[in-house]
Interface confidence: medium
């Protein structure tokens, strides 16, 4: 049997259908059905229209385009290539839009792209080359200077055993082509750990938003590289306690803020360092709202006003809270 | 050369089990979803099941739901589809297909194998 | 669950006429979603027309496909005897997700 033709005047990693563009160009004010337009915002929203793939008459001016609230399943290759490209879309928001499955290449073709939002999709197949679009060893930078993956977990039935923090992080490491990432969020997505490997290969991050995951230690975490970090939010996580590595790393980093709380903090001889730590430094501006949750006669005690008498580890901890 | 080569067919009694195998050669397998699709000796196609390139994403006809696992190697570079709770009305020849993947025109099959027989049959 | 039904079930056509088989599914879709394919006797079906009118690799020109919405047809502009075979349209919708095929217009030659 014989494969489909594949014409095409990009150079790409993947083949470019020219009939997958609209067969003309749009004309400069056109509008797609079921989209709203303004030339002089250089906006586009086709918002809540159960859209099931991406308008191929998108306006050459676009620079914001709104896609949410759609069901587009898949994200194929090229599926915002177009003849003449979108030179101008500089923000993309396709968050709340069923999107299951992103493959390699989905953004190719958008030499602008500076802000994607894929949050609240269900990703159970994000491609290690969704945003580098080539599997080379070091591919050329991508645009994208702001990354908003907030909820793409998807549901706990549809994860077919695989690593999900594995999954995301290979995306965001292929061929380092996010290395001119200032802005990463990933709250919301049921993290259990942080891979070794995630924070290296993202050395321009100055915001990194992990709240609202289920974190419960920072141990194989490196933030040595990331030297311009200026935010990052582990709220709202299962963090015990923080290591002498950890707080050192923070300490060497000169303009970071750690926001740490609501998180099950152990108040016990491990503690000791991170309470000392907490007393001095000017780098977790909540620190006054961090409070024990255990052992139970701890429990409601702000970190700061422990001494290391009060830190022992004669205290048996829940059964759940032994196992990291 | 892009081949699929189907095995593991055979006959099975009604309530059995069998397992079906798709070896492709040719192609980066990982870069490809992949389906299962059947052709009914009254000679219908019909879809049964598809698997996204990483394998994370998968989908089922609702009559094989909870009866059929589709899955993947991607490092054997070959598709499995495991039956059980087979019925007589799942006799038909079963292929796999490859979907392409670099256009937007989705779930378009451009490469299929030659099929292998399955008889559900007391 | 959308519905593909075929016309004709079965049709013979002499060498040089145009023959039309249409599609028509059971509520609106996109037309990239809506494919065909060829099968002959004996043989694994070809992939044949993508997205409602782009021919696949080596399909002769005297193909075409068109339509949009609930209505779709291929067209042969002048039969040939190699022509001959069951053509099957196929369709995808996201939600829920479920891929569906016509039930076949085979196509003879007279």
């Known amino acids: 049997s014989s494969p489909t033709s594949s014409a095409s005047s990009f150079s790409s990693s993947a083949p470019f259908l020219a009939s997958a563009v609209s067969a003309q160009p749009p004309l400069p004010d056109q509008c797609p059905a079921l989209c709203e337009c303004s030339e002089a915002a250089r906006t586009v929203k086709c918002v809540n229209r159960n859209l099931t793939e991406v308008p191929t008459d998108l306006p050459a001016y676009v620079r914001n385009l709104f896609l949410t609230g759609n069901q587009l399943a898949v994200l194929p290759a090229g599926a915002f290539a177009r003849r003449p490209p979108l030179a101008e879309l500089a923000a993309l928001n396709l968050s709340g839009s069923r999107l299951d499955e992103v493959r390699a290449g989905a953004f190719e073709h958008l030499p602008s792209l500076r802000q994607l939002d894929l949050s609240h999709n269900p990703l159970a197949d994000l491609s290690p080359f969704a945003f580098s679009g080539s599997n080379a060893s070091v591919s050329a930078p991508s645009p994208l200077v702001e990354l908003i993956l907030n909820h793409i977990v998807p549901p706990e039935d549809e994860r077919q055993n695989r690593s999900f923090e594995g999954m995301v992080v290979a995306a965001l490491r292929s061929g380092l082509a996010l290395r001119g990432l200032t802005r990463l969020e990933l709250a919301s997505n049921h993290f259990l750990f942080l891979p070794r490997d995630l924070l290296a290969q993202l050395p321009s991050l100055r915001y990194l938003d992990l709240r609202n995951n289920s974190l419960v230690s920072l141990t194989y975490a490196s933030f040595r590289n990331l030297t311009h970090l200026e935010s990052l939010h582990l709220e709202d996580n299962a963090l015990k306690v923080l290591h002498n590595s950890t707080l050192a790393e923070w300490h060497g980093l000169a303009h970071v803020k750690v926001f740490l709380d609501n998180n099950p903090w152990v108040c016990d001889c491990y503690m000791a360092d991170m309470v000392a730590w907490l007393k001095e430094t000017e780098v977790v501006p909540d620190k006054a709202r961090l409070t024990c949750a255990f052992p139970e006669k701890m429990r409601n005690r702000g970190l700061l006003d422990l001494n290391s008498s009060d830190l022992d580890c004669d205290a048996v901890l829940p059964q759940s809270l032994q196992t990291s | 050369e892009v081949m699929l080569v189907e095995s593991g067919g055979g006959l099975v009694k009604p309530g059995g089990s069998l397992k079906l195998s798709c070896a492709a050669s040719?192609?980066?397998?990982?870069?490809?979803?992949m389906s299962w699709v059947r052709q009914t000796p009254e000679k219908r196609l019909e879809w049964v099941a598809y698997?996204?390139?990483?394998?994370?994403?998968?989908y089922y006809l609702d009559s094989v739901k909870g009866r059929f696992t589709i899955s993947r190697d991607n490092a054997k570079n070959t598709l499995y589809l495991q039956m059980s709770s087979l019925r007589s009305e799942d006799t038909a020849l079963f292929y796999c297909a490859r979907e392409e993947s670099y256009n937007y025109y989705r779930h378009f099959f451009d490469y299929w194998g030659q099929g292998t027989t399955l008889t559900v049959s007391s | 669950e959308i519905v593909l039904t075929q016309s004709p079930a079965l049709m013979a056509a002499s060498p040089g006429e145009k023959v039309t088989i249409t599609c028509s599914v059971s509520?609106?879709?996109?037309?990239?979603?809506l494919h065909w394919y060829q099968q002959k006797s004996g043989a694994s079906p070809k992939p044949w027309i993508y997205g409602t009118s782009n021919l696949a690799s080596g399909v002769p020109v005297r193909f075409s496909g068109s339509g949009s919405g609930t209505s779709f047809s291929l067209t042969i502009s002048s039969m040939e005897a190699e022509d001959a075979a069951t053509y099957y349209c196929?369709?995808?919708?996201?939600?829920?997700?479920?891929?569906?095929f016509g039930a076949g217009t085979k196509l003879e030659l007279k």
């Open positions: 040719g192609f980066t397998f990982s870069d490809y979803a």
């Open positions: 698997i996204s390139s990483g394998g994370g994403n998968t």
């Open positions: 196929q369709q995808w919708s996201s939600y829920p997700p479920i891929l569906t």
């Open positions: 509520s609106s879709i996109s037309s990239s979603s």
